[in-house]
């Protein structure tokens, strides 16, 4: 069940997704990848109010929960609903190939 | 890849599955739901150090970034990698209904 | 499996425009860093790099010919497109496609052969 | 746009025989240039990425080496399915450029 879109806290508060630049030094992959030099990484970000987004029963519990014991148990989390495929061109023993990554690139967010 | 299990944190730090006792009140499910009467939640909480229990390259990413840009990316968080089933027996219009949720408790856990 | 497949070569009148198709499988131009570009080699010669689209439908092109060329994409039928207009005789050559990613061509077409001929 | 200059432009040899192709680029390219081969009637084949890579499945008698202008192609052994046309191409900026060719054949 995909809640609610609107975010309680304010324009671009909750959770969303975001692209933030990366080196290949930033991402720690400078020995094991040639190319791309540069990724935009897009990620889940933003918080979970109540209702926002919830992934599913196990979100609408988590709220309802953390609203009870916010000392116990966590707000929802924003992460990654589903994911963008992306390419590297990456080091090998003998050379190079190009290998695709379906886990890398947040494609949409919800919250969970 | 399933990263490391060992929680630098110390025992039970780490994200992990837990159990919460909650009943149809707390879960704000009392107008709807006939039993159990109350539901022992399993949930995933707890910190997400460096490629603890990494989901995904995504997460590894996020560890990375996090480290770099703690104010702007957050560390990854720890949510359910799978579910288990639970039936709840359910008021309907015209009596009751057992119905099973594949979405609801929290079977194991990872870092995302 | 990786296969590009090349087709709309044939026989072209001076001034008139062609349109080439790719289509391809094995990979999908969503994912990022995969780009398909148009190669040609005209009879006897070397190859000469034309234009390629990139996931984010970024586009480039050879400086000399850039006025005639559109490269285009169909994302959902794994299809691209290369039209070249007021086409003369040194146009005449073969035309591959070719996979990228990133600087990588590493998967081409068979080819398909264009000639400008009244 | 960079020109790319390959030489020579034929050469003749015998299986077992090393071959040396250069390419120079009309300005620097760091390492970014590959090499295809083209056999008559058929598509190009990638070999060598980024000046030294050789790309997944290609033998280890190719390789490639040189940084900036100059750039070198080697085959340390010729085997009689090697006689081609080989291409250099700069992948440093667009307009991406190729060489004139090698054609490599049979003494």
């Known amino acids: 069940a995909r809640n609610g879109d609107h975010c309680p806290l304010g324009p671009g508060r909750c959770c969303r997704l975001h692209t933030v630049r990366a080196s290949l030094e930033d991402l720690g992959w400078a020995d094991w990848v040639l190319s791309p030099r540069e990724v935009q990484v897009t990620m889940c970000i933003g918080a979970c109010p109540s209702q926002f987004r919830a992934a599913n029963m196990h979100a609408q519990i988590k709220t309802s929960l953390h609203r009870l014991k916010p000392d116990t148990v966590p707000a929802p989390c924003c992460v990654p609903a589903s994911y963008n495929p992306m390419v590297l061109i990456q080091k090998t023993d003998t050379g190079v190939s190009l290998q695709t990554y379906d886990d890398l690139l947040a494609k949409d967010c919800h919250c969970i | 890849a399933r990263n490391g299990d060992h929680c630098p944190l110390g025992p039970g730090r780490c994200c992990r599955l837990h159990t919460v006792r909650a009943s149809l009140e707390d879960l704000g499910w009392a107008d709807w739901v006939l039993s159990p009467r109350e539901v022992q939640v399993t949930m995933c909480i707890g910190a997400c150090p460096s490629q603890f229990r990494a989901a995904n390259m995504h997460a590894q990413i996020k560890t990375s970034l996090h480290r770099l840009k703690p104010d702007t990316v957050p560390a990854p968080c720890c949510v359910p990698a799978s579910y288990n089933p639970m039936v709840l027996i359910q008021k309907t219009d015209t009596g009751v209904s057992l119905q099973t949720y594949d979405d609801l408790l929290a079977k194991d856990c990872h870092c995302i | 499996q990786v296969t590009l497949l090349e087709s709309g070569g044939g026989l072209v009148q001076p001034g008139g425009s062609l349109r080439l198709s790719c289509s391809f499988s094995?990979?999908?131009?969503?994912?990022?860093?995969?780009?398909v570009g148009w190669i040609r080699q005209a009879p006897g010669k070397g190859l000469e790099w034309l234009a390629h689209?990139?996931?984010?439908?970024?586009?480039y092109f050879n400086t000399a010919l850039k006025s005639r060329l559109t490269i285009s994409k169909d994302t959902s039928k794994n299809t691209v497109y290369l039209q070249m207009n007021s086409v003369r005789a040194e146009d005449t050559a073969v035309y591959y496609c070719a996979r990228m990613g990133y600087d990588i061509m590493d998967y081409w077409g068979q080819g398909t052969t264009v000639t400008v001929s009244s | 746009d960079i020109v790319m200059t390959q030489s020579p432009s034929s050469l003749s040899t015998s299986v077992g025989d090393r071959v040396t192709i250069t390419c120079k680029a009309s300005q620097d390219v760091n390492t970014a240039v590959a090499w295809y081969q083209q056999k008559p009637g058929k598509s190009p084949k990638f070999l060598i990425y980024s000046s030294s890579y050789r790309y997944t499945g290609v033998p280890d008698r190719f390789s490639g080496s040189g940084s900036g202008t100059d750039f070198t192609f080697t085959i340390s052994s010729v085997q009689p399915e090697d006689f081609a046309v080989y291409y250099c191409?700069?992948?440093?900026?667009?307009?991406?450029?190729f060489g004139g060719g090698t054609k490599v054949e049979i003494k």
């Open positions: 094995g990979f999908s131009l969503s994912t990022y860093g995969i780009g």
């Open positions: 191409q700069q992948h440093y900026s667009t307009p991406w450029t």
């Open positions: 689209i990139w996931w984010n439908n970024n586009k």
